[in-house]
C-alpha cells in the first residue's frame, strides 16, 4: 500500500550482500526520510518477506519460510533506514530481494542480491593404504564449489581423482594425493572465493632417523612463520603410526596452554613450547617404537603436518644375547 499522492520515483540501485550459512545478516536499504512510511520486502519479486505500514509490522501474508526470521530497525525507520535484519540464513535464501519504500513524497526501490556461503574447517590427513601413502585434503561442507590447489615444492600440480558429493546445502569434498615414496613437501589450499576464506594444509617429510634400543630420540616440529602465529588458537598433536592407524602420544592446546601426555616416555620442553617449538623427546627406545611419527599443528586456517620415520635397531648387548 502506497499513499496516493504526487511522488518522485527514485530508480533502483543494487547491492550484493554475502552471508554465511546459519548466521544473521542485514539487507541494507535507505530512503529519504518522510512521513507515512510503507516498507515492503519481497524475494524474487513474488514472495512476501516483510511488510510494515501505519507504524507497525503486517505479517499476515508473509511467506512461511520467513516466519520469525525478519525484523526492521524500528527506531531508525524515521531516519530513513528500511534495512532488514535476517536471521539464520540458509542456501535456499539466496537470490534477489527488493525493498519498496513509499513515503508521502516518493517511492524508492532497492535491490539486494543475497549470496550465501559455507566453509567448515577443512582437514589434511595422512593415510597408509596397503603399501601406498596418501595425503587427503577434505572439507565436510563448502559452498559454492571451492578452488583446490595442490603444490609440490611450491609448484602447482594436478590431483587426479577428487571425490565430490553434493547435497541440497553444500558440497563435501575429498581430494587425495598419492605421495608414495616421495620426500617432497606438499601444500593443499582450499579457497572459498565468495566468503574470501582460505585454508592451507602443509606436509613435510623429515629425513629418517636410525637409533639404537634404549637410546632417546629428538623429533623436531617447528612451524614455518609464514602461516603460523602464536596469537591464534591452535592445537599440536604428536602421534605414532602402528599397523596403519595413528595413536596419540601427546597434545597441546594453545588456548589453555594445556599439555596432555599419553605416553610416559614422551617429553615436551615447556620453554621450547613458549618459543613455538613443539619438538619432542622419546626416551628409552625399544624395537616396537620403530615407525612413523606425525606432528600436527592445526588452527581454523591451516594444518601443518611434519612426519618423521624412526628405525630402532637392537643394541649390541641385545644382539649378543640373541
Amino acid at each position: 500500500i502506497f499513499p496516493l499522492a504526487f511522488f518522485i520515483y527514485v530508480p533502483m540501485n543494487e547491492q550484493i550482500v554475502i552471508g554465511r550459512l546459519d548466521e544473521d545478516i542485514i539487507l541494507p536499504s535507505s530512503f529519504e526520510r518522510g512521513s507515512e512510511v510503507v516498507i515492503h520486502w519481497k524475494y524474487q519479486d513474488s514472495y512476501k518477506v516483510h511488510s510494515y505500514y501505519k507504524g507497525s509490522d503486517h505479517l499476515e501474508s508473509q511467506d512461511p519460510r520467513y516466519a520469525n526470521r525478519t525484523s526492521l530497525f524500528y527506531n531508525e525507520i524515521q531516519n530513513g533506514n528500511a534495512s532488514l535484519f535476517f536471521r539464520r540464513v540458509s542456501l535456499l535464501d539466496e537470490g534477489i530481494y527488493t525493498c519498496y519504500v513509499g513515503t508521502a513524497i516518493q517511492v524508492i526501490t532497492n535491490k539486494v542480491v543475497l549470496k550465501v556461503g559455507v566453509f567448515l574447517t577443512p582437514v589434511m590427513k595422512y593415510e597408509k593404504r596397503n603399501t601406498n601413502s596418501f595425503l587427503i585434503c577434505s572439507v565436510l561442507s563448502v559452498y559454492p564449489r571451492p578452488i583446490i590447489t595442490w603444490k609440490m615444492d611450491n609448484t602447482p600440480i594436478s590431483e587426479n581423482n577428487m571425490e565430490e558429493t553434493g547435497s541440497l546445502d553444500s558440497f563435501s569434498i575429498n581430494s587425495p594425493l598419492n605421495i608414495t615414496g616421495s620426500n617432497s613437501s606438499y601444500e593443499c589450499t582450499i579457497e572459498n572465493s565468495l566468503l574470501k576464506q582460505t585454508w592451507t594444509g602443509r606436509w613435510t617429510m623429515k629425513d629418517g632417523l636410525h637409533k639404537m634400543q634404549s637410546e632417546h630420540v629428538s623429533l623436531s616440529c617447528q612451524p614455518v612463520n609464514d602461516y603460523f602465529s602464536p596469537n591464534q588458537d591452535f592445537k599440536v598433536t604428536w602421534s605414532r603410526m602402528k599397523s596403519g592407524t595413528f595413536s596419540v602420544l601427546a597434545y597441546y592446546l594453545s588456548s589453555s596452554q594445556n599439555t596432555i601426555i599419553n605416553e610416559s616416555r614422551f617429553s615436551w620442553n615447556k620453554e621450547l613450547i613458549n618459543q613455538s617449538d613443539f619438538s619432542m623427546n622419546l626416551m628409552d627406545l625399544n624395537l616396537s617404537d620403530s615407525g612413523e611419527y606425525l606432528c600436527n599443528i592445526s588452527s581454523d586456517e591451516y594444518t601443518l603436518l611434519t612426519i618423521h620415520t624412526v628405525h630402532v635397531e637392537p643394541s649390541q648387548e641385545t644382539a649378543s644375547h640373541n
Partner: antibody, heavy 119, light 111 residues
Framework: QVQLQQSGAELAKPGASVKMSCKAS????????IHWIKQRPGQGLEWIGY????????EYNQKFKDKATFTADKSSSTAYMQLSSLTSEDSAVFYC????????????WGQGTTLTVSS | DIVLTQSPASLAVSLGLRATISCRSS??????????MHWYQQKPGQPPKLLIM???NLESGVPARFSGSGSGTDFTLNIHPVDEEDTATYYC?????????FGGGTKLEIK
Amino acid sequence: QVQLQQSGAELAKPGASVKMSCKASGYTFTSFWIHWIKQRPGQGLEWIGYIIPNTDYTEYNQKFKDKATFTADKSSSTAYMQLSSLTSEDSAVFYCARGLRGAYYFDYWGQGTTLTVSS
Amino acid sequence: DIVLTQSPASLAVSLGLRATISCRSSQSVSTSTNGYMHWYQQKPGQPPKLLIMYASNLESGVPARFSGSGSGTDFTLNIHPVDEEDTATYYCQHSWVLPYTFGGGTKLEIK
C-alpha cells in the same frame, strides 16, 4: 566496506629513501595478505612482493629484493613499504592490494601512491 | 620469469558486440583442475579491479557479460555485449610460481 587508503604523493631525490603506507579498513587486517605492485607511467604492472601481517613474513620478487622492505603494524591495520637508493627508474605509481591467504591474486586495491624521483 | 603476452595491444569494438582479449604465457600455468590466470580491468586514473580469477571464476559483483576461459598457455577474456563503461585497459596475471607477472595490457575502446 573494504578499503585500502594509501599515503599521498612523494617527491624524492636520487639516492634517498621513502616510506609509503597503506591503511586497511572494513575487514580483519591479519586474515589477509598485503601485496605491493608497481606501475610506471604508461606501462604495465609489476608485482613487488607481499607481507603477511599476522606473522610479518615477507616474500619479494628477486628484482626488488634490495629495493623494497615491507613492514606491518597490526595495531593500526597499516602496511608500509620502504624504497631505498632511489633512482629515476623508481618513479611510478605504487599500489598496495589485498590478497587471500595462499591465493595470489588481488581482490581490493589502494588508490596508489605516486613517487617522483628527481634531482 | 614467466612472460605473459597479451593481444591485441588495443582494440575498438562497437557497442553491444563481443570483445575478445588473448593472453599467452611462455610456459603452462594450469593443472588438470585449475588455470592460474587472473584478469583485471583498469580505467584511467584508477587502480586495477579484479574481474576473473583462476581463468574462469567471476569475482562477486562483476557483471556476467565478462567471462574467462583457457588452459595451458592460452587464456581468453570475453566481454559480451560490450558496454560504454567497459572502456579500459585489461591485464592478465599468473600465479603459477614466483614472481607473479602481468601481461602488457590490452586497451579496449568502445565505438
